[in-house]
Interface confidence: medium
């Protein structure tokens, strides 16, 4: 054993050595290497990249690196029968067709296997009909259409702009409204920042650029054919009719040049207000159908994509812990991309690669982490978080007993303005302390800490002098670890200024123009933001794997529980009469939160005072910290969402990307005034308050003295 292994002390210089070993130039080199050809899930190119990463991680010094394969449902366009949308005249002649592919970016004209824009898992179909413009296709947009404007989408093809919410929620909402097809498009209002040129001259979306993406509503299920279990060699697969989360109507994405041609002819109702207008020179009429001169013309979709069971490959690397090898800290990010993956995911994968290299360098010098670190390169994230979910399903018994933390590592940048962190409250103090030790890469903050620039640019809404940290939602590979298994999770990346740039995500997201050059020319020429993200992600992993006492502060959970209880109570108090009529009380929840606060405070005091040289007591206290997140898991899951089991957080039912607090109560209260049976609806609210109060109380008791 090395001297570090023989003692329980991790010298501070090891963290410094780890961070100092991370190099921007390496991240740049890795990003270039990962982005020269497409790495679509299920393709030979992505299998070859998996093997390359396996080989390099072994060279870097990991103890073992294995491929874990699964056979999952994926979706591809038909190579000989392309997808498109037409405007047809009364004779059925196609008088306009949308483009079949994006014009390739300079230098990539001869690259083969660029998958054309498509909505993954769309069923086949050729619906034709009148168009209805549904804004962002959010729940509230359909409420506005159906309830206020009395516009019926049944039997119509709807056109929705991308942005605000996950595209799968848009499709689900359209289905529920009775639509027979969905056209998704990128409006310049959301994907073209003023004053910036289109790619290749800037980072804006050109008119021919299109966002790909899956349109599933999996609710955490993983492979649609094997929910709850790994898609292994002896898996029992559901029939396609019983598959989880597949859309039932054809869906297709287009760019704003093609959208202009469809929207400029729209007639019917005017947009209800300015929030329904984008930036195209069209009236943004809602429809249904085209205006006067064009009223006999219809829209027709031609969708021929196929769903196929296909093999995918995760790469799993292990760096065995010296003291607690049965405690796992996981760093994972995906490898598969829609096309080149310049930002998503390879800006993240390049950072993971450099973190592995740095850890490997320390290991070659005789160092080991206290706990085991697992590194993962996930496959098929873009098709519904499939690689991570299947692996977690296969290893769930190990993970629920041994999983300390999961740090996600998708795109390292979505802008270059400031840090963005979403994580469990248990990690707030870890993130604060770490960022105080790191240098800010921001202009104007030379010699200042990352914490300072972050706090200045993204202040907490509640706590003066602290940065904003957001709730975890979903739409990325932490989902199964946090929402299903209850493993403390976090993610970090550099982001844009959300105050000044209200466009959704980054403009070139999931388009062919997401290239190495996009990053190197426009986002991060010096790769200093990538390096900072590597330091944050790597630093979190280092501390989680190496701290003698786990760097979790349970008091921060107490603070947010009170905030979330206040919030959900205030939502319920919009209905004071019904609360009185049905005897709805939040007393049990507030009481449980109070108990949690007191017990967490006492636990924290004991944590300061206990004898850290006693390995049994140390392990006991660390286990209480590790299992606290697990204590918020309800084995029965949320109503109709069995794989979302965390009682405090779940992806919003209206937007998979966003996190909702006390989601069971929130969903029970949502639109309750429209429920046909108020007694039943308020009964469900009461049941959800009971579940939440019990869970918070039960979690609190896991922090009590054990005997």
């Amino acid at each position: 054993k090395s001297s570090n292994e023989a003692t329980n002390i991790t010298p501070k210089h090891n963290m410094k050595a780890f961070l100092d070993e991370l190099k921007a130039e390496n991240i740049k080199k890795f990003l270039y290497n990962f982005t020269q050809i497409p790495h679509l899930a299920g393709t030979e190119q992505n299998f070859q990249l998996a093997k390359q990463i396996q080989s390099q991680w072994k060279e870097f010094g990991l103890d073992s690196v294995e491929l874990a394969h699964y056979d999952v449902l994926l979706s591809y366009p038909n190579k000989t029968h392309p997808n498109y949308i037409s405007i047809i005249n009364e004779d059925g002649n196609e008088i306009f067709n949308t483009s079949l592919f994006e014009p390739p970016p300079p230098g990539y004209e001869n690259v083969s296997d660029i998958v054309p824009p498509f909505s993954a898992f769309s069923p086949q179909g050729m619906p034709e009909g009148d168009l209805v413009y549904v804004n962002y296709a959010r729940t509230e947009d359909f409420f506005k259409l159906e309830r206020d404007m009395k516009i019926n989408c049944s039997g119509k093809i709807v056109i929705a702009r991308y942005g605000k919410v996950f595209r799968g929620n848009k499709v689900k909402n359209a289905q529920l409204a009775g639509a027979k097809g969905v056209i998704l498009y990128s409006d310049p209002a959301d994907y073209f920042a003023p004053g910036v040129k289109s790619y290749p001259d800037g980072w804006n979306l050109p008119g021919g650029g299109v966002q790909r993406g899956n349109i599933l509503n999996l609710n955490g299920a993983g492979d649609p054919l094997t929910p709850g279990y790994p898609a292994n060699e002896y898996a029992y697969r559901r029939g396609i009719a019983e598959a989880v989360g597949l859309p039932s109507i054809p869906v297709h994405p287009i760019g704003y040049y093609d959208a202009q041609k469809l929207l400029e002819k729209m007639g019917g109702s005017a947009p209800p207000d300015s929030s329904w207008r984008g930036s195209l020179k069209v009236p943004y009429n809602v429809g249904p159908g085209f205006t006067g001169n064009f009223s006999t013309q219809k829209v027709k979709m031609h969708i021929h994509s196929t769903n196929e069971v296909t093999r995918i490959y995760n790469v799993i690397g292990t760096l065995r812990g010296a003291v607690e090898p049965d405690r796992y800290v996981i760093l994972g990010g995906h490898r598969d991309s829609w096309v080149f993956g310049g930002i998503d995911p390879q800006s993240g994968a390049a950072v993971v690669h450099e973190i592995v290299r740095s850890f490997g360098t320390l290991k070659k010098e005789g160092w080991r982490p206290r706990r085991t670190i697992l590194f993962a390169s996930w496959d098929a994230e873009e098709f519904g978080l499939l690689g991570s979910t299947e692996w977690a399903e296969e290893n769930s018994r190990l993970l629920q007993e041994r999983g300390v933390a999961y740090i996600n590592a998708d795109s390292s940048i979505e802008g270059n303005y400031t840090l963005r962190v979403d994580c469990t409250p248990l990690m707030y103090s870890l993130v604060h302390n770490l960022t105080k030790e790191l240098k800010s890469p921001d202009e104007g903050f030379e010699g200042k800490s990352l914490y300072e620039s972050w706090t200045k640019k993204s202040p907490s809404p509640e706590f003066s002098g602290m940065p904003r940290i957001s709730k975890l939602g979903s739409g990325n590979d932490f989902e199964v670890f946090f929402q299903r298994l209850g493993i403390a999770s976090g993610r970090a990346r550099y982001t844009k200024n959300w105050e000044t740039n209200k466009f959704s995500g980054y403009p070139l997201y999931h388009s062919v123009y997401e290239t190495y050059e996009l990053v190197e020319k426009f986002y991060d020429p010096m790769f200093k933001y990538h390096l900072t993200v590597a330091q944050v992600r790597g630093g979190m992993v280092f501390e989680l794997a190496n701290s003698i006492v786990l760097p979790f502060d349970c008091r921060d959970y107490a603070v947010v529980l009170r905030k979330y209880a206040d919030k959900i109570y205030s939502i319920s108090m919009k209905h004071p009469q019904e609360m009185k009529t049905y005897s709805v009380s939040f007393d049990s929840l507030f009481s449980a939160v109070k108990n949690f606060t007191e017990i967490a405070s006492k636990f924290s005091e004991r944590l300061q005072d206990f004898d850290k040289s006693n390995p049994i007591v140390l392990r006991m206290m660390n286990d209480q910290l590790m299992f606290l997140e697990r204590a918020f898991i309800d084995p029965l899951g949320l109503p109709d969402r069995p794989f979302y089991r965390h009682v405090i957080y779940a992806p919003s039912s209206h937007n998979k990307y966003a996190g909702e607090s006390f989601p069971g109560i929130y969903d029970a209260l949502f639109d309750i005034e429209s429920k046909v049976d108020p007694s039943k609806a308020w009964g469900e609210v009461k049941r959800q308050i009971y579940v939440a109060a019990f869970t918070v109380q039960a979690a609190a008791e896991t922090l009590s003295e054990v005997a």
Epitope: P461, E462, S470, W498, D566, S570, I571, Y657, S661
Partner: nanobody
Framework: QVQLQESGPGLVKPSQTLSLTCTVS??????????WSWVRQHPGKGLEWIGF???????HYNPSLKSRVTISVDTSKNQFSLKMSSVTAADTAVYYC???????????RGQGTLVTVSS
Amino acid sequence: QVQLQESGPGLVKPSQTLSLTCTVSGGSISNSGYYWSWVRQHPGKGLEWIGFIYYNGSIHYNPSLKSRVTISVDTSKNQFSLKMSSVTAADTAVYYCARDGDDYGDYLRGQGTLVTVSS
């Protein structure tokens, strides 16, 4: 659906106090996890954050404007207000009120109102 509308005088004399009000419709200002902010955009420049008030009453200001700015809320009218004292020509800008939330991307802005500081 929540909408925000700014109102107030379009012309303010130098050294006087600028007063703007934001009326929120389609949702209550007080009973959710949102916070309500003021931002401004000088002609031909980017947006500048002025400050925000959280639903629980806590207020944060841009340090460079802190000494001149007051943000307040009137929950009974579903409005929040901005007062900026000792204005100069440099305060000429389009002023926006905005809503944000716990989550990134939960951003919603009013149409904006041009305020000119001139004698």
